[in-house]
């Protein structure tokens, strides 16, 4: 019996469409596959950052595959051919791998790249990052924000900066259709006629840096002699009920009595007769059901009773 | 509840000066651009400019270039334009309005401070 | 400076029917792939009501029978079907670059 072998891919390789991290990788059908017409032949495709401890593999009969890279680091991929062992009436055979890198070349030293850079989406609604400028840059350094994510048909330049001193150092974005749930991407990169300046890539999925407005419309409510209901409403704008966790700051009598954790609009609290105030705050954040991470919104304005009769039905500021 | 405070009126003589005062509350006060805009009566709305409190950015329309001065207090969330040369010209409403970025308009308005000018 | 001219200066129309603004600007307001268009609302002695930005979203809590189309230096508001609580001055105002202006305002009033 002769050995049955394949060819890797032809052709492997990284292509960049300007959508700052989003790449394709992409080959051609390996050489000489005459013999197994019949074949539905597979690749196993093996791609990376370098600097990254583990591969992402993954087996398709596709000539091309998309994902997400860290612009700032290279990457590099490997490929190879698999015939199913249908195809070879015994066991799989797996060609060589062929082999690819892409990166872009770094200009300027890290030091002249952005620093701190903080991206907030507010409400769900209005995202706006901040930078400060690269150490020991000139004033007539000046740097660009564009961002990409998919449905849009290519990457956009900040519409409204942020500017201190004549520098940009930050983006009020315009509305972003479409644009949670899935990988945004960010390219910040400047000028400077006296130096070449380095850029910087950034990834993130909008749902997990919300920081939502906070509660509103704070009750009192009259349970029973011992107990009493805070209650408050959703911050307004478009987040769901379902999307919220809260924390709570009750004060009673001027002494922290409880911070709480809850997932809906109420607090039952125990109390005694001789409580002469009481206070709460509220904060709501975007919990796990909708977002992987998020950002506590501002404490409520503070809503409190104070008097003889905490008995009375309803305490409504 | 996004709320933008500003007095009813002001009286002002001929040739003086006056600043008009827009308290913001309900919402981070750095975040978004305050604009300042002029309405006589029966007349069209009149942009005069407007001032970014995150860093004190400020664009004017030239019309009102040496009019009007913006400026912010972002301790007190106040927005200040002050207006110099008074002349019964400048006897209008003027609204401050929040907005976030060109792109979204301008959607918080206050109730707007009517200025007479007369001796 | 960019120059709005809105029509016609008013309008009546009858209620449950459609009403129809025009604004045209003197040079395109589209960048970025966007239309810095945006429509208000002014009734007497109030302040102007954000009704669409961008040409064709809608502000925060207004009506859907509100709704703005266009992009260049053509543009229109559509109010259907037409309610009393419409009866207003309604002004176009682009805000693609320093200074924003704003169109010279369509009364539209009940038929």
């Known amino acids: 019996d002769t050995e049955i072998k394949v060819n890797p891919p032809q052709d492997f390789e990284i292509v960049d469409p300007g959508y700052l991290g989003y790449l394709y990788l992409q080959w051609q059908p390996p050489l000489s596959l005459d013999h197994f017409k019949e074949c539905t032949v597979e690749y196993e495709l093996k791609y990376r950052n370098i600097g990254s401890e583990t591969w992402k593999t993954i087996i398709t009969k596709n000539l091309h595959y998309k994902d997400g890279f860290d612009l700032n680091k290279g990457i590099e991929a490997k490929i190879h051919t698999l015939l199913p062992w249908q195809c070879t009436n015994g066991s799989e055979v797996q060609s060589s791998w062929a082999e690819t890198t892409y990166w872009i070349s770094p200009q300027g030293i890290p030091e002249t790249k952005v620093q701190d850079m903080d991206c907030v989406y507010y409400n769900w609604q209005y995202l706006l990052c901040s930078w400060k400028p690269g150490i020991g840059v000139l004033l007539d350094t000046n740097y660009n924000l564009f961002y990409w994510y998919e449905g849009l048909d290519h990457a956009l330049q900040c519409v409204d900066y942020i500017k201190a001193d004549g520098q940009n150092i930050g983006c009020r974005f315009p509305y972003l259709e479409a644009s949670d749930y899935k990988d945004f991407y960010i390219c910040v990169n400047g000028s400077s006629e006296n130096k070449p300046i380095r850029s910087s890539y950034f990834t993130f999925q909008l749902q997990n840096i919300v920081k939502p407005l906070p509660p509103v419309y704070l009750t009192f409510t009259r349970e029973s002699s011992c107990e009493i209901k805070l209650k408050w409403s959703i911050p307004l704008g478009p987040i769901p009920a379902r999307c919220f966790d809260y924390e709570i700051e009750i004060r009673e009598d001027d002494t922290t009595l409880v911070t709480a954790t809850v997932e809906n609009e109420t607090y039952t609290l125990k109390t005694t007769n001789e409580t002469r105030q009481l206070c709460f705050v509220v904060r709501s954040k975007v919990n796990i059901a909708c977002s992987d991470d998020g950002i506590w919104s501002e404490w409520s304005d503070k809503q409190c009773w104070e008097g003889e009769d905490l008995s009375k039905k309803t305490l409504l500021r | 509840q996004v709320q933008l405070q500003q007095p009813g009126a002001e009286l002002v003589r001929p040739g003086a000066s006056v600043k008009l005062s827009c308290k913001a509350s309900?919402?981070?006060?750095?975040?978004?651009?305050m604009n300042w805009v002029k309405q006589r009566p029966e007349q069209d709305l009149d942009w005069i400019g407007r001032?970014?409190?995150?860093?004190?950015?400020?664009d004017y329309n030239q019309n009102f270039k040496d009019k009007a001065i913006l400026t912010v207090d972002k301790s007190s969330s106040t927005a200040y334009m002050q207006l110099s040369s008074l002349t019964s010209e400048d006897s209008a409403v003027y609204y401050c309005?929040?907005?976030?970025?060109?792109?979204?308009?301008?959607?918080?308005w206050g109730q707007g401070t009517s200025v007479t000018v007369s001796s | 400076d960019i120059v709005l001219t809105q029509s016609p200066a008013s309008l009546a129309v009858s209620l449950g029917q459609r009403a129809t603004i025009s604004c045209r600007a003197s040079?395109?307001?589209?960048?970025?792939?966007?239309?810095?268009m945006n429509w208000f609302q002014q009734k007497p002695g109030q302040p102007p009501k954000l009704l669409i930005y961008?040409?064709?979203r809608q502000g925060s809590g207004v009506p859907a029978r509100f709704s703005g189309s266009g992009s260049g230096t053509d543009f229109s508001l559509n109010i259907h079907p037409m309610e009393e609580d419409d009866t207003a001055m309604y002004f176009c105002?682009?805000?693609?670059?320093?200074?924003?202006?704003f169109g010279g305002g369509t009364k539209l009033e009940i038929k």
């Open positions: 309005a929040r907005g976030y970025g060109t792109a979204y308009g301008v959607d918080y």
């Open positions: 309900g919402y981070t006060f750095s975040n978004y651009l």
């Open positions: 001032i970014d409190p995150y860093d004190g950015d400020i």
């Open positions: 040079e395109s307001v589209d960048n970025y792939g966007i239309s810095f």
């Open positions: 961008a040409a064709s």
């Open positions: 105002q682009q805000s693609k670059e320093v200074p924003w202006t």
